[in-house]
Amino acid sequence: KLLQVSTIAMQQQEKLIQQERALLNFTEWKRSCALQMKYCQAFMQNSLSSAHNSSPCPNNWIQNRESCYYVSEIWSIWHTSQENCLKEGSTLLQIESKEEMDFITGSLRKIKGSYDYWVGLSQDGHSGRWLWQDGSSPSPGLLPAERSQSANQVCGYVKSNSLLSSNCSTWKYFICEKYALRSSV
């Protein structure tokens, strides 16, 4: 009889431990949920306020039609320039039209004067074809004016109102491009 009572008591104690564990898990889960909810709310708030304050382009970027442009203040080789743009959610400038070229060169004149700026144009080593970074061909009027005599990889850059070519390992400023945010209003 005593053994039976002792067994029941042990079972009850085991049940109690399990329930305590479950309660602890539940409390922990509830706390975690509350924290996540708080975090989510903060994130949403943040997103909403930044969406509310957002202009089509980030600070220090220039807008023209559907694009935003960033003119770098540092020099780098072409490949590093490409990575610097990606870091900002953009790519090296891809000039689609004479109008865009005019806008860029006009803006550069106002900002910095006559320096060299890498754009997203490079020459295929085998075929010698010029291609933008997305693989598309430049329109005939937007081909670099002079063929670089470099044995190394050749990339395109803008200077004054011309598109020129140079060894990709030389140091230049660069221009990044990203799509402008569409206004939801």
Epitope: L86, K87, G89, T91, E177, Y179
Partner: nanobody, 116 residues
């Protein structure tokens, strides 16, 4: 912390195709860009292709016309479809992501071997 999990690497014949995938997880809501680098034995790591959050694309010269990068917004996943593979495409391929705070994270890498 952000985790990147690559898959799809393997052994393929010259001229064959392969599709690499990379899924980002962890504390990530959105990103600035995602892409692929590769490193062949004894060579420097080089950018193969990348896609920005706005959908802008960039490819290495060696990838143009043969490789296509795409992404699934809903799952923070990026794919690299590689076709007309050559022996010189043999390398370890690493997925990378640039987050909103401009940090760059890397995956562990997946091996691609193109045999003739």
């Amino acid at each position: 912390q952000v985790q990147l999990q690559e898959s799809g690497g393997g052994l393929v014949q010259t001229g064959g195709s392969l599709r690499l995938s990379c899924a980002a997880s962890g504390s990530i809501f959105s990103f600035n860009a995602m892409g692929w680098y590769r490193q062949a034995p004894g060579k420097q790591r080089e950018l193969v292709a990348a896609i920005t959050d706005g959908g802008r694309l960039t490819y290495a010269d060696s990838a143009k016309g043969r490789f296509t990068i795409s992404r699934e917004n809903t799952r923070n996943t990026v794919h690299l479809q590689m076709s007309s593979l050559k022996a010189e495409d043999t390398a370890d391929y690493y997925c990378t992501i640039w987050t909103r705070d401009r940090q760059q994270y890397w995956g562990q890498g997946t091996q691609v071997t193109v045999s003739s």
